[in-house]
Interface confidence: low
């Protein structure tokens, strides 16, 4: 929005709220809100909440250093997770747990259940809970190619830490391959980094799920936190609508909320699903800070540009040298939601829902 | 721009051209075009053209996989390069060129001459010309810490190739460190990747500048293409204006130039510096395809949203659920230019000058 006229803030907010109503339905490819007649009583199942929280954590982690995201991600992604095959499975017997490596295997039938076709997969992350680490450790991740062949994927320098920490590796390409192939069990290897000169590195890092001798409740908790694949995929019924492009990213904000800036700025707008949209079908979250961009972006006639003060305004008001600059979102963040389809709770992530900053463009 | 009214295309173009006049001066922090009284006769020096071409190559390489760029990069960056110390220098005698590594050293006084203060450095790339490669090679880059200590930086999987190819490694952080420290010579090591199991890897890749026995003209050509650091930095005189944020990026285009789309689209606009701006002071290029965004982005009232056809329009016309969607640039590319300040030719890169695609936002 870019205008010098007096703005009816209420109308702008109402239009933004109404646009969000359509946007959410559109992203979920729903013509109308889903019926709530089949929803079971009581709170959301623990497993669903755990999944929702994993997704929220992923979002929080990314806002600090966001990944480029295909704009085919306009459409919501269904989020699922597949736990590592437990270490007492016979597959582990074939791979000696050496001093420099640990192995993690996954059942591809579970992966295919979650993502029926490779093209539907938007992102796959291998999540490992690393326990406290006394020394810095350089680790490498490999993909199983055949019984005795491993392909290097990526590496990570792990800083010493007194507290456990989730590690995340992007393994989208690998999981896409696995979904295309016929194998039953596929795996990764996490190894110490060895240079050609110093080859005696030991894997010092302790990954949750590999410590032996746990019993009872402790073993269950331990098992829940064992390595897993976090998958984000387009549901099959939305597959035909896929298209691709890319999305921009940036940083900013605090200034706008601590001033009454008249020019282009991000304006606070909290959407309460129940109060603002009359929706009870989204179970988590209860609402979110959608925000919006508002304020003029003055066009600067460069007839005045012999004055360096005027030139300095370009960066703020018209950095792209537009013929009619406009106040639009710069940094956007996704929103994970939980809702029911019939009796089945779903966790989905909606891209580009939260406006963090604006720019004149 | 977002309007349904009849548009005076000529006026829009004129406003875009005038805005670009101010934008370029603003990015260079010039109140008016620089005086050309000191410019020497004849063509640009070879070294300047080579630098300009390096910068252009960098741009071409990036549009395929653009790097996130701080928006302090709004202001132009001066581009310089520092060649690797030649291999006959005694520093190389201390490091045996083993079968799995090659070494590259740089004179930090040359770096400091190019970038007087670490904070001014925006980006540093290590550029290596790799010659043809028969097999796939996994290589690792290390930074020299002390005579016998090396710190891992990054790795690259090199595909087999019949033709030479420039490799680029982002070493911004390392060069910033070097600029902060007092050392005279600093270096990198390129090594074959060795896993803890298979340790007999040989560095198969042939990097230009390390082949011995060349003479005369061939040696000169070879020397020019030896490894170098490409540096982009804020000139000292513009340093006080530094501020930070982040910039967005995306992909798209061809459709708009081959259609008569009435809605939001990228529109062709070539700026000839001499004809359109009356400027003779930019030596390279003579002009550029600035382009601009134009066309309506209809607001979709979700009162109509019971119709799934209407919902499908959200992705195209109002993906961000704006109260007043606007046609703005999505993918922008930088523009390197060559101009003189007094007798001194400068190569500078101006960010976000070329509009490659537009979006409703």
């Amino acid at each position: 929005l870019s205008t010098s006229k007096t703005i009816d803030m209420e109308l702008v907010k109402r239009k933004r709220i109404e646009a969000i109503r359509g946007q959410i339905l559109s992203k979920l490819r729903l013509a109308s809100p889903p019926s709530q007649g089949e929803v079971p009583p009581g709170p959301l199942p623990e497993a669903v909440l755990a999944l929702y929280n994993s997704t929220r954590d992923r979002v929080a982690g990314e806002s600090a250093e966001p990944e480029p995201e295909p704009e085919a991600d306009y459409y919501a992604k269904e989020v699922t997770r597949v736990l590592m095959v437990e270490t007492h499975n016979e597959i582990y017997d074939k791979f000696k747990q050496s001093t420099h490596s640990i192995y993690m295997f996954f059942n591809t039938s579970e992966l295919r259940e979650a993502v029926p076709e490779p093209v539907l997969l938007s992102r796959a992350e291998l999540r490992l809970l690393r326990l406290k680490l006394k020394v810095e450790q350089h680790v490498e991740l490999y993909q199983k190619y055949s019984n005795n062949s491993w392909r290097y994927l990526s590496n990570r320098l792990l800083a010493p830490s007194d507290s456990p920490e989730w590690l995340s590796f992007d393994v989208t390409g690998v999981v896409r391959q696995w979904l295309s192939r016929g194998g039953e069990i596929e795996g990764f290897r996490l190894s110490a980094h060895c240079s050609c000169d110093s080859r005696d590195n030991t894997l010092q890092v302790d990954i949750n799920g590999f410590t032996t001798g746990r019993r009872g409740d402790l073993a269950t908790i331990h098992g829940m936190n064992r390595p897993f694949l976090l998958l984000m995929a387009t549901p099959l019924e939305r597959a035909q609508h896929l298209q691709s492009s890319r999305h921009r990213r940036a940083l900013d904000t605090n200034y706008c909320f601590s001033s009454t800036e008249k020019n282009c700025c991000v304006r606070q707008l909290y959407i309460d699903f129940r109060k603002d949209l009359g929706w009870k079908w989204i179970h988590e979250p209860k609402g979110y800070h959608a925000n919006f961009c508002l304020g003029p972006c003055p066009y600067i006639w460069s007839l005045d540009t012999q004055y360096s003060k005027v030139l300095a305004l370009y960066n703020q008001h018209n950095p792209g040298a537009s013929a009619a600059p406009c106040c639009v979102p710069q940094a956007l963040e996704p929103l994970p939601i939980v809702y029911y389809v019939g009796r089945k709770p779903k966790v989905e992530q909606l891209s580009n829902m939260i406006v963090r900053s604006c720019k004149c463009s | 721009l977002s309007t349904s009214k009849t548009i005076d295309m000529e006026l829009v173009k004129r406003k875009r051209i005038e805005a670009i006049r101010g934008q370029i001066l603003s990015k260079l922090r010039l109140a008016s075009p620089p005086s050309q009284g000191e410019v020497p006769p004849g063509p640009l020096p070879e070294a300047v053209l080579a630098l300009y071409n390096s910068t252009r190559d960098r741009v071409a390489g990036e549009s395929a996989e653009p790097e996130p760029e701080p928006e302090a990069d709004y202001y132009a960056k001066e581009v310089t390069r520092v060649l690797m110390v030649e291999t006959h220098n005694e520093i190389y005698d201390k490091f045996k060129q083993s079968t799995h590594s090659i070494y590259m050293f740089f004179n930090t006084s040359e770096l400091r001459e190019a970038v007087p203060e670490p904070v001014l450095l925006s980006r540093a790339e290590l550029r290596l010309l790799r010659l043809k490669l028969k097999v796939e090679q996994h290589v690792e880059l290390y930074q020299k810490y002390s005579n016998n200590s090396w710190r891992y930086l990054s790795n690259r999987l090199l595909a087999p190739s019949d033709s030479p190819e420039w490799l680029s490694f982002d070493v911004t952080g390392v060069v910033r460190q070097w600029l902060s420290r007092g050392g005279e010579i600093e270096g990198f090591r390129l090594s074959a990747h060795c896993s803890c199991d298979s340790r007999d890897n040989t560095l198969q890749v042939d990097i230009n500048g390390f082949t011995t026995g060349r003479r005369g003209d061939l040696a000169t050509i070879h020397g020019m293409n030896r490894p170098f650091l490409l540096l982009m930095a804020t000139p000292l005189e513009r340093a006080q204006h530094l501020q930070s944020s982040r910039h967005r990026r995306a992909l798209d285009t061809n459709y708009c130039f081959s259609s008569t789309e009435k809605n939001c689209c990228v529109r062709q606009l070539y700026i000839d510096f001499r004809k359109d701006l009356g400027w003779k002071w930019i030596h390279e290029p003579k002009g550029y395809h600035a382009n601009f965004c134009l066309g309506p982005c209809p607001y979709i009232w979700s009162l109509d949203t019971q119709y799934s056809k209407v919902l499908a329009l959200y992705n195209q016309h109002n993906p961000g659920a704006s109260a007043a969607p606007c046609c703005v640039p999505q993918a922008l590319e930088p523009l390197p230019i060559v101009y003189y300040v007094g007798r001194k030719p400068k190569v500078e890169q101006l960010s976000n000058m070329i509009v490659r695609s537009c979006k409703c936002s």
Partner: antibody
Amino acid sequence: EVQLLESGGGLVQPGGSLRLSCAASGFTFSSYAMSWVRQAPGKGLEWVSAISGSGGSTYYADSVKGRFTISRDNSKNTLYLQMNSLRAEDTAVYYCARVDSSGGYWYFDLWGRGTLVTVSS
Amino acid sequence: DIQMTQSPSSLSASVGDRVTITCRASQSISSYLNWYQQKPGKAPKLLIYAASSLQSGVPSRFSGSGSGTDFTLTISSLQPEDFATYYCQQSYSTPLTFGGGTKLEIK
């Protein structure tokens, strides 16, 4: 302890000038917009002026525009109100208030005790 | 400028009573409304912000509601320390404006 302490009030003749100060402590001063609010004897509250955290933006009530100037020195954690061309109707207790702008709602979550300004001949 | 009108201007009530004070804006201000309490000789104190959000440390007997032009402050069960003057304030646009105040007295 988080607190605001006003000073500089007193008796001044019509047409005269006065400079109020507000010393802030116990919080990151530069992170907050600040404001002056006044209250004439026996009357209600009246917003006077506000300033953004950096000092880059200032806002005034019509009744004081052109006569009063709000400013801040973040290095000294101090807010100021320079009052010129004072009138009898400016007589009031002047409160310094911290603005919590989270959400853009601009509410005054911390107040000083106030300083009395009396304009009289 | 946005005018804020409070009613009643004064009110007598007893300990334990439920009390409602209303505030009306001259134009829609969404939920950009705050409530303050002031006791004689003291500085005002924030009770409610954004129409319905309770400021931390404020007893839960205070609640705010409303949106647009009409707002209410409710004290569910009046306590002796609640006898004071109450002000509403809009932050929809500058100039920021306060209501004239409602003086709550002991009956």
